[in-house]
Amino acid sequence: YDFTNCDFEKIKAAYLSTISKDLITYMSGTKSTEFNNTVSCSNRPHCLTEIQSLTFNPTAGCASLAKEMFAMKTKAALAIWCPGYSETQINATQAMKKARKSKVTTNKCLEQVSQLQGLWRRFNRPLLKQQ
């Protein structure tokens, strides 16, 4: 999916008002210095591509974040403010319903959510030069 035409300001507002808080809640009890940011993004569409990948694609050691509150809100924001995004999720939703229902917080998941926090922060500062 190409995130170029999303309403970035409305997605940013949703992040600042609610998604950011859910990410913090998920990470509660973890030191902010515990994980190094290894995933980066260069512009807003690229950031959303990386955010979608880390949020919804299972990785080794972190089977699924998709049922977490921050993920549900991310999905809603993309569906509402990214043209044509919702139709790409019709089959993905069916697959998610069949997926394992239990929510397990592993160290790998914490690391992944820490990366997500970095990507979202970068998304909110699009004019900063890439380090």
């Epitope: 008002s17 999905k75 919702s86 999720q89």
Partner: antibody, heavy 120, light 107 residues
């Protein structure tokens, strides 16, 4: 079963405001956005805006920006649409309709409609 | 804003006949089109979503097709209860918009 029950008909004077309610039941309120659509007599359907409980935010059709305010009370699963500075052209049936925001993504259930008549 | 134009405005047919309703978008919207039926004094009812997906409880004589800018709703054999107004809607991008409507009336 899913039900959206709207408030009763209203007769309003030009320049005044109207607030229409839509009480939802039979599903998890925060899993769906609540959209408002209006239909003038003998005309087609016009999307006004939406409230997304999951994100606690609204979005509007620019044609109604500044005049329409869409809110919700999550504790009672009730959505509201307030339209101000009413004029005769606002005489219409106003519908609420739910739409999944993390699945389905379509207006699959509608309220019965509320007729708002604006007349001096 | 994406404009949806429906044609014809009115379709006069007899029960048992096939109805073909068209919806054209002002720009490509992939498959983000849904079809609704509305009878006088009633709220719209969802018939087809995302161009061709069927809804449980909707008779299988209703089918949808198309992608990009051209979409079609087909009613294979009209029943008496099918005479109504039909609207297409796009949810590709905000503001969501509806088509102008096609009235299917008894000939």
């Amino acid at each position: 079963q899913v039900q959206l029950v709207q408030s009763g008909p209203e007769v309003k004077k030009p320049g005044s405001s109207v607030k229409v309610s839509c009480k939802a039941s039979g599903y998890i309120f925060t899993d769906y956005a609540m959209h408002w659509v209006r239909q003038r007599p003998g005309q087609g359907l016009e999307w006004m805006g939406t409230f997304i409980p999951l994100l606690d935010t609204s979005d509007y059709n620019q044609n109604f920006k500044g005049r329409a305010t869409i809110t919700a009370d999550k504790s009672t699963s009730t959505a509201y649409m307030e339209l101000s500075s009413l004029r005769s052209e606002d005489t219409a049936v106003y519908y609420c309709a739910r739409m999944g925001v993390t699945h389905s993504y379509v207006m699959d259930a509608w309220g019965q409609g509320t007729l708002v008549t604006v007349s001096s | 804003e994406i404009v949806l134009t429906q044609s014809p405005g009115t379709l006069s047919l007899s029960p048992g006949e096939r109805a073909t309703l068209s919806c054209r978008a002002s720009q490509p919207i992939s498959i983000s089109v849904h079809w609704y039926q509305q009878k006088p004094g009633e709220a719209p009812r969802l018939l087809i979503y995302f161009a061709s997906q069927s809804i449980s409880g909707i008779p299988d004589r209703f089918s949808g097709s198309g992608s990009g800018t051209d979409f079609t709703l087909t009613i294979s054999r009209l029943e008496s209860e099918d005479f109504a107004v039909y609207y297409c809607q796009q949810t590709f991008s905000l503001p969501y918009t509806f088509g102008t409507g096609t009235k299917v009336e008894i000939k």
